[in-house]
């Protein structure tokens, strides 16, 4: 039961995390105008990975896309790439993990296959989370670096040269969403990897035990002791006979509305 719970929770946490990474990537508030000692402003600037926006005190908001690839800073391109890689890996990981879920029965898929798929999706979630955290951190570092460079006639945000002290930008909501989402995806991935250990077929000292109701001989087939590799052994007490019973993890045996056939 613990394995299913760990796997299911890992999936849900990763799902929330990836949804957060997608949301962060699409958000416009990656950097927002620093209001320092002036909480009310007539013109408020904020920028995302794909466009920059201006909100006037009148309530009118205007957003302009960055309709250039070559003209954008390399760091911004790198952040975009990291976030997209994170989303793609996360999406593939989600797809794989759906089929790896123990509570979902797909034909006669063996536990070993599910274990491998769980491990694969777990690794994908970990890499996805790391990509998101890296992307957000690179952008945050850019902001910190540029924060004090607010002298006259300097490059400002995505704009050009101006005749005033440049607009200073600080961390936007998207950065915090990205950090949290990346962390959740990472945690979800770790949980999937932990669940994988419990899903892998158990290698015991007794490879098989034959029971013959009519016969007098009981055949023991000893199996050589195998050192655990970490993911290979199962810490659960699985029954080594097939008497029609199943472990708690295998209770759902009949197709239901949750099954993928």
């Amino acid at each position: 039961m613990a394995v299913t719970a760990c796997q299911g929770l890992g999936f849900v946490v990763s799902l929330i995390g990836i949804a957060g990474i997608i949301a962060a990537t699409c958000m416009d508030q990656w950097s927002t105008q620093d209001l320092y000692n002036n909480p009310v402003t007539a013109v408020f600037n904020y920028q995302g990975l794909w466009r920059s926006c201006v909100r006037e005190s009148s309530g009118f908001t205007e957003c302009r896309g960055y309709f250039t690839l070559l003209g954008l800073p390399a760091m911004l391109q790198a952040v975009r790439a990291l976030m997209i890689v994170g989303i793609v890996l996360g999406a593939i990981g989600l797809l794989v993990s759906i089929f790896a879920l123990k509570c979902i029965r797909i034909g006669s898929m063996e536990d070993s296959a599910k274990a491998n798929m769980t491990l694969t999706s777990g690794i994908m979630f970990i890499v996805s989370g790391l990509c998101a955290i890296a992307g957000v951190s690179v952008f945050a570092n850019m902001l910190v670096t540029n924060f004090w460079m607010s002298t006259a006639n300097m490059y400002t945000g995505m704009g050009g040269m101006v005749q005033t002290v440049q607009t200073r930008y600080t961390f936007g909501a998207a950065l915090f969403v990205g950090w949290v989402a990346g962390g959740l995806t990472l945690i979800g991935g770790v949980m999937m990897c932990i669940a994988c250990r419990g899903l892998a077929p158990e290698e015991t000292n007794y490879k098989a035990v034959s029971y013959h109701a009519s016969g007098h001989s009981v055949a023991y087939k000893p199996g050589g002791f195998k050192a655990s590799t970490g993911f290979g052994s199962n810490t659960k007490n699985k029954k080594i006979y097939d008497g029609g019973a199943r472990t708690e993890d295998e209770v759902q045996s009949y197709p239901s509305k949750h099954d993928y056939v």
Epitope: N38, A42, S52, S57, S58, G59, F60, T156, G159, Q163
Partner: antibody, heavy 118, light 113 residues
């Protein structure tokens, strides 16, 4: 069409208070900030402050913080400005305005002429 | 606060003439985020409230005759009336819309000969 209706004139005594009204019609009152502007006879324009009818949040020119209080009544689509401790310096025409693109004041009331005299 | 300085304080012209008035701000009104200048021009005729002519330094308000043109960027702005008409007799004000408190210039009084 958009209209901002203000009473024509107010005659008040020094040291007292006056509450000026501005009734909006022809647009969604709660969607636009209402601003107030002062114009002394034969002089220029001074921005007093603004209020958002929906949230009630306001922002004042530091110069008028102790002089003016902005309020709204959403039900009647009316903005109010209370001026306190009136002196002859407060004798002026007070306009209410609405702002739109570019933070520009696109519609103005006809103005209320406040005369402070004993 | 941003100080707005208008010049000349008054000018007298004949109908049909081209008129230019200037407005200088103590700080730039150019917003880097959208590359727009937050400067507005108003026209105030005697006994009337001001009327919006131009916003974003050069965008003409709907219904305003095309003889009115706004230009400039940063700290220096100009309002041009290509061919003055008798009904243009008024005081013209420029206003900072970029930062609070919003501030107005002292005005340029246009008189017709």
């Amino acid at each position: 069409q958009v209209q901002l209706q203000q009473p024509g004139a107010e005659l008040v005594k020094p040291g007292t208070s006056v509450k000026l009204s501005c009734k909006a019609s022809g647009y969604t009152f709660t969607s636009y900030w209402t601003h107030w502007v002062k114009q002394r006879p034969g002089q220029g324009l001074e921005w007093i402050g603004m209020i958002h009818p929906n949230s009630g949040s306001s922002n004042y020119n530091e110069k008028f913080k102790s002089k003016a209080t902005l309020t709204v009544d959403k039900s009647s689509s009316t903005a109010y400005m209370q001026l306190r401790r009136l002196t002859s310096e407060d004798s002026a025409v007070y306009y209410c305005t609405r702002i739109h693109y570019g933070n520009a004041m696109d519609y103005w009331g006809q103005g209320t002429s406040v005369t402070v005299s004993s | 606060d941003i100080v707005m300085t208008q010049s000349p304080s008054s000018l007298t012209v004949t109908a049909g003439e081209k008129v230019t008035m200037t407005c200088k701000s103590s700080q730039s009104l150019l917003n880097s985020g959208n590359q727009k200048n937050y400067l507005t021009w108003y026209q105030q005729k005697p006994g009337q409230p001001p009327k919006l002519l131009i916003y974003w330094a050069s965008t003409r308000e709907s219904g305003v005759p095309d003889r009115f043109t706004g230009s400039g960027s940063g700290t220096d702005f100009t309002l041009t009336i290509s061919s003055v008409q008798a009904e243009d007799l008024a005081i013209y004000y420029c206003q900072n819309d970029y930062s609070f408190p919003f501030t107005f210039g002292s005005g340029t009084k246009l008189e017709i000969k």
